[in-house]
């Protein structure tokens, strides 16, 4: 299952950690996809490491763990964020976070 804070807030110009926690006794995480609405933020692969989308490369830092640190936030970053955990042999699990960026 995926456990996450469903709603988080942060100040404009600040940073926020996007984090989903996956728990399973048997399944291994092989890949994690992070998206802002339908736009790819980053992908973590157990075999290849991190790929951060070029449009976000100056503001998105991998970690902690399989989460993301989103920096230099703007009001336009307000919205839904999705983590998708690809696991073996457990299948695919999804989590949702709503980020509200507030004026500083």
């Amino acid at each position: 299952t995926i456990d996450t804070k469903r709603n988080i807030s942060a100040e404009e110009g600040g940073s926020v950690i996007l984090q989903c926690h996956f728990s399973s006794d048997t399944a291994e995480v092989t890949q994690v996809d992070w998206k802002q609405q339908d736009q790819l933020l980053a992908i973590y692969s157990v075999d290849l490491g991190w790929h951060v989308a070029s449009v976000f490369s100056d503001r998105v830092v991998p970690g902690p763990s399989l989460g993301l640190t989103f920096q230099s936030l703007t009001m336009n970053d307000t919205g839904e964020y999705f983590c998708t955990y690809h696991t073996y042999p457990g299948g695919i699990y999804k989590g949702r976070i709503f980020l509200k960026v507030q004026e500083s």
Epitope: T30, Q31, I43, S45, D47, L48, G49, W50, H51, H86
Partner: antibody, heavy 119, light 107 residues
Framework: QVQLVESGGGLVQPGRSLRLSCAAS????????MHWVRQAPGKGLEWVSG????????GYADSVKGRFTISRDNAKNSLYLQMNSLRAEDTALYYC????????????WGQGTMVTVSS | DIQLTQSPSSVSASVGDRVTITCRAS??????LAWYQQKPGKAPKLLIY???SLQSGVPSRFSGSGSGTDFTLTISSLQPEDFATYYC?????????FGGGTKVEIK
Amino acid sequence: QVQLVESGGGLVQPGRSLRLSCAASGFTFRDYAMHWVRQAPGKGLEWVSGITWNSGLIGYADSVKGRFTISRDNAKNSLYLQMNSLRAEDTALYYCAKPVPRLRGLDVWGQGTMVTVSS
Amino acid sequence: DIQLTQSPSSVSASVGDRVTITCRASQGISSWLAWYQQKPGKAPKLLIYGASSLQSGVPSRFSGSGSGTDFTLTISSLQPEDFATYYCQQAFYLPWTFGGGTKVEIK
């Protein structure tokens, strides 16, 4: 024993294409990510491309992005590198390599196949 | 992309010497760093992965350390077969990248 054998290299003119192959044996190919690494004559190592076991994630060096395509056929235990719009600076020995599972060090390498781009 | 800077680019040493090679990453890469040895005309050989884990079959005189941005490969007592070129490689971010290499030569 674990073995990787590259083929398909040769002399090609600038702007033309070439397809490299890597035949894998001695391990369960479908369980592993795979990589291409190249080395220009007298120069250092350059990572070219990598692909996950199911082709779910693929990466390329900036120097080849948009020109080279990595692919695999798990049924044939084979890895491929399609090289288009070749340039003189692509001249190198191309190695196929297998990683230590989940640990990302490249522990098995082929003997390499030489690609020479020249008019 | 992550740049890896190796130093020195070459080193002259004698059998029995302790040799240290450093690799600095342009951004933090946790412990996702590997070290390779390459001899002329041969494919690279994996020595260390995960910054400090010794690959099976590699002599214990080789050791790796570091995390984040600064890493070290140490050969505690140089042997005749260790004269070669050594490369670091990061696997935290795509694209993976190699350092420029360090040639260990006979003094």
